[in-house]
């Protein structure tokens, strides 16, 4: 026969009652039956007791009594009773429900959301439940999206049912924000709220928080988490794929970190206890929201035992330069479980020897190499618990770009000047890893004769290898070479002599090794001139005479020679250009600039100074010469000339010292007859002395001297006596 | 960018009138309703009025302006407008139009207008 | 007169972590969500905290909102000096069917 339902006391589909009240509701049926409460009303609450009894003619149907003592308004709901064990095709006929409100004044709504809002989960066209639902089913409730809008039910796209709350028919994103429930009881305005999110498949981000690829020794547990970004109104579904699926080996714990205000974290963890090697091979942790899907994999490896194996990466001597910024020197290892690094250089810790030296992995980081970084390096790799140690030795070398130490302390600014014809030594000591070899070049010097330029030696001319037999430029006497320990290092000094000292030019010393090349260049420049800088005044002049003046410099170390005179005006002392380069002659060696003043007068007197600017360091040279112009003077004799007498045959000599300015002539005469220099006569320095050499008879007689200059003359005279008879007279 | 740009600040006598404007760009403006917020000289904060979305169901005004002020909008203009009729010496301050945040609170204000009412 | 009631100042050394109040009833806060702004001189309010606990993106950490009953407070930790500003809370009021202001809380951060 057909089974009739259960039958409940209490009739109709919904029933109030108040808040602290008893509720009694009674199940009747044919067949054993069960309740079915709302999720707040616990089973184990001592308010609730359910007696079963038999009943009915003859006790043949099955009843039970459902009581809940002080009942409260979060109870309210569905309260149904149905048959145990029944097919559920039939459940029409299997089950009575009743729906029951808890009337509180004081509690208007179910659920309270007051403090920390409900979130609810929306999608865009689909139904929206604002879920609150009241303990009384004539309590007048408003929606509002806060705090401006009300949403008013229309009985079609917004509908009110005090069982559920606000249904919303088809939801767009103007439903997205806060939507609270209203509800005035007794004056009191009650608030329940909500925020409604758009729901989403956005996945941001998957990533397995583990190193790759994970390793473990057998019989530990693998722990591999699975963190699923997304943002705040997405949900996810993570499943994990692993080798040793089908006997469902591993377990899994989910959770959600909400605490972010701007994204949602979910986490899926998978545990292996007690690996196996079944349980290597490749876990890929699948996140799918709707139709969006990431996944993200990682392989694991299990080792049966602890193990070191460690070879050298390229070849077991290495190289380096020094300078480098930063030097990794590293091995290949393979190690399970990592193991303690220690590097050692030269047997003692490295990383203690240096704060340049840096352990990372199985490399050590040498910062800013130098030359003291070289030599024996060593790997210590450990893994104690387990009692397995290696060790492997390399070694560095550190090479050196070859230094020339003259150029590191020459303090010259500019270059030296080297005397015409002399002997020079020339030496370059250099410095490297490996040693450098010296070789010595030659670069003449460009002269150039035109008169709009200076001479100047540039690095655009060409460059001679020299050997000691070279025959370009300077005779060179020897080029040799000595190792010499400089500063505790083993230096290279190559010495070039130069024999004899006659073109300018340029000799470079080259080092080299296979770092690179480094060069010093010694500007070689020929002075025929004292100091490369000569000032000379021909003589100092009188009134009317000429003021000649003369300024050589070395021409590849000097430009723009002018002659200035200097003149004090007003304290201030003015330079007068009186004379420029172009009127210079260039000769091989030297520039000279000449300064000719013709019949100076007092005026002319002065201060004159030969200026000129160094090539190299762009200074102006001044060399000064003092000109004191002389008053003319009329000559006088110092002394008189006096009568003396002379052995014939034998020599004498007549004084006509006289001064005057300018610088008087002097004129001899004998006997009124003027003088010329003859063989057995010489006229002196400025014919100021007379010398007659094997005196004769003939040279007795009146001598006299006239010294002459513009202001007037002197003279005086004197006889000349000769004394004894010549050969002839004798022999008669 | 979401913006407020108030306009139509300036002096005006006792019992005056003003209207403010302000033009919203940068997001939907007609799904959001909207405030005028006012700021005395070195005073605090005062809400002044509030529309909903649609402007046709809630307006509402603080105790002291109402009769006197009227919030309006133009949704298809982008546009907030608060008329001020009858302006008082108490009046006088710096107007903020801003914006309802989904979630509650004003998340976006303009850089105000001022407003002086003095004879 | 402020319906919302706040401190009208606050002080903290850079570091330190400071509070400040806000109090008003069951119309506003006791019934209604809290929000907090910060107003830098010269500037335009900026919206700091809503629904009572809530930064928006761009507000950091060290701001942190909380209510209970009728009143709520914004706690500021780690002080910096760009912090200087003032700050108002604020909340609808069902009584009065409006936002309701604090009058602000003037904070200086010292040293």
């Known amino acids: 026969s057909k089974l009739k339902g259960p039958e409940l006391s209490l009739k109709g589909t919904q029933h109030v009652t108040q808040a602290g009240q008893t509720l009694h509701l009674q199940c009747r049926g044919e067949a054993a039956h069960q309740w079915s409460l709302p999720e707040t009303v616990s089973k184990e609450s001592k308010r609730l007791s359910i007696t079963k009894s038999a009943c009915g003619r003859n006790g043949k149907q099955f009843c039970s009594t459902l009581t809940l003592n002080a009942a409260q308004a979060n109870h309210t709901g569905f309260y149904s009773c149905k048959y145990l064990a029944v097919p559920t095709s039939k459940k029409k006929e299997t089950e009575s429900a009743i729906y029951i409100f808890i009337s509180d004044t004081g509690r208007p709504f179910v659920e309270m959301y007051s403090e920390i809002p409900e979130i609810i989960h929306m999608t865009e066209g689909r139904e929206l439940i604002i879920p609150c639902r009241v303990t009384s089913p004539n309590i007048t409730v408003t929606l509002k999206k806060f705090p401006l809008d009300t949403l008013i039910p229309d009985g079609k796209r917004v509908i009110w049912d005090s069982r559920k709350g606000f249904i919303i028919s088809n939801a767009t994103y103007k439903e997205i924000g806060l939507l609270t429930c209203e509800a005035t009881v007794n004056g009191h305005l009650y608030k329940t709220n909500y925020l409604t999110h758009r729901q989403t498949n956005t996945i941001i981000d998957v990533q397995i928080s583990t190193p790759r690829p994970v390793k473990l020794l057998r019989g530990h547990t693998l722990i591999l988490n699975c963190t699923a970004t997304t943002p705040l109104n997405t949900r996810v579904q993570m499943t994990w794929s692993y080798p040793d699926e089908k006997n469902k080996r591993a377990s899994v714990r989910r959770r959600i970190d909400q605490s972010n205000s701007h994204a949602n974290i979910f986490y899926s963890v998978l545990t292996i206890d007690k690996v196996q090697n079944k349980d290597k091979g490749l876990y890929t942790c699948r996140v799918r929201s709707g139709p969006s899907f990431k996944s993200v994999n990682t392989s694991v490896h299990i080792y049966d035992k602890a193990f070191i194996t460690v070879k050298h990466r390229k070849q077991q001597v290495l190289e380096t330069v020094a300078g480098k910024r930063s030097y990794r020197l590293s091995m290949k290892v393979k190690a399970f479980p990592s193991p303690e690094v220690v590097w050692l250089k030269d047997g003692l810790p490295a990383t203690e020897k240096s704060a340049r030296y840096l352990t990372r992995g199985y490399s050590l980081i040498i910062k800013d190499v130098t030359e003291e970084d070289a030599g024996n390096y060593t790997i210590l790799l450990s893994i104690k618990q387990s009692n397995v140690f290696k060790n492997l030795t390399a070694t560095l070398i550190v090479n050196v770009k070859p230094q020339i130490y003259e150029k590191a302390v020459s303090s010259f600014p500019d270059p030296a000047l080297y005397p015409l014809g002399s002997r020079q030594i020339l030496t370059c000591t250099a410095y490297g890893i490996p040693r450098p070899t010296i070789k010595w070049c030659w670069r003449p010097c460009n002269h150039n004769h035109s008169e709009a330029r200076y001479d100047f030696c540039s690095n655009n001319e060409e460059s001679f290898i020299l050997d000691p037999d070279s025959n370009i430029g300077n005779r060179i006497e020897s080029i040799t070479q000595r190792m010499a320990i400089i500063e505790g290092k083993n230096k290279t000094a190559s010495t070039l002599v130069v024999a004899d000292s006659r073109i300018s030019g340029i000799y470079s010393c080259i080092a080299s090794n296979k770092v690179g090349t480094v060069g010093r260049n010694i500007s070689f420049y020929i002075t025929d001139v004292p100091n490369g800088f000569h000032v000379n005044l021909e003589k100092m002049p009188t009134e009317g005479e000429d003021l000649k003046l003369s300024c050589t410099v070395n021409k590849f170390l000097y430009r723009d020679v002018t002659w200035i005179l200097l003149r004090t005006v007003n304290n201030r002392t003015m330079h007068y250009s009186i004379s420029k380069q172009k009127m210079a002659i260039t000769k091989e060696h030297s520039i000279t600039l000449n300064l000719t003043i013709m019949n100076v007068s007092l005026e002319d007197s002065g201060t004159y100074a030969c200026r000129a600017r160094n090539v190299y360091t762009g200074e102006e040279i001044l060399q000064k010469k003092e000109v004191t112009i002389r008053d003319q003077e009329a000559p006088y004799l110092l002394r008189n000339l006096s009568d003396h007498t002379v052995a014939i045959s034998s020599s004498t000599t007549l004084d006509c010292h006289a001064n005057g300015a300018p610088e008087p002539q002097i004129t001899w005469f004998k006997n009124n007859h003027k003088i010329q220099q003859e063989p057995g006569i010489i006229l002196g320095p400025g014919s100021s002395t007379l010398f007659i050499e094997r005196v004769t008879e003939e040279d007795e007689g009146v001598y006299h001297c006239k010294a002459t200059n513009q202001k007037g003359s002197v003279e005086s005279s004197a006889y000349l006596t000769v004394q004894g008879t010549s050969d002839k007279s004798n022999l008669e | 960018e979401v913006q407020l740009l108030e306009s139509g600040g300036g002096s005006v006598q006792p019992g005056g009138s003003l209207r403010l404007s302000c033009t919203a760009s940068?997001?939907?403006?007609?799904?959001?309703?909207m405030n005028w917020v006012r700021q005395a000289p070195g005073k605090g904060l005062d809400w002044v009025s509030s529309?909903?979305?649609?402007?046709?169901?809630?307006?509402y005004h603080v105790d002291s302006v109402k009769g006197r002020f009227t919030i309006s909008r133009d949704n298809s203009k982008n546009t907030l407008y608060l008329q001020m009729n009858s302006l008082r010496a108490e009046d006088t301050a710096i107007y903020y139009c801003?914006?309802?945040?989904?979630?509650?609170?004003?998340?976006?204000w303009g850089q105000g207008t001022t407003v002086t009412v003095s004879s | 007169q402020s319906v919302l009631t706040q401190p009208p100042s606050a002080s903290g050394t850079p570091g330190q972590r400071v509070t400040i109040s806000c109090s008003g009833s069951?119309?506003?806060?006791?019934?209604?969500?809290v929000n907090w702004y910060q107003q830098i001189p010269g500037t335009a309010p900026k919206l700091l905290i809503y629904?009572?606990?809530q930064r928006p993106s761009g507000v950091p950490d060290r701001f942190s909102g909380s209510k209970s009953g009728t009143s709520a407070s914004l706690a500021i930790s780690g002080l910096q000096s760009d912090d200087e500003a003032d700050y108002y809370c604020?909340?609808?009021?069902?009584?009065?069917?409006?936002?309701?202001f604090g009058g602000g809380t003037k904070l200086t951060v010292l040293g």
């Open positions: 604020a909340s609808w009021d069902d009584s009065l069917n409006g936002w309701v």
């Open positions: 629904l009572n606990s």
């Open positions: 940068g997001f939907n403006f007609e799904d959001y309703g």
């Open positions: 529309i909903n979305r649609n402007g046709d169901i809630s307006t």
């Open positions: 069951r119309s506003n806060i006791g019934n209604n969500f």
């Open positions: 801003t914006k309802n945040h989904d979630y509650h609170g004003m998340d976006v």
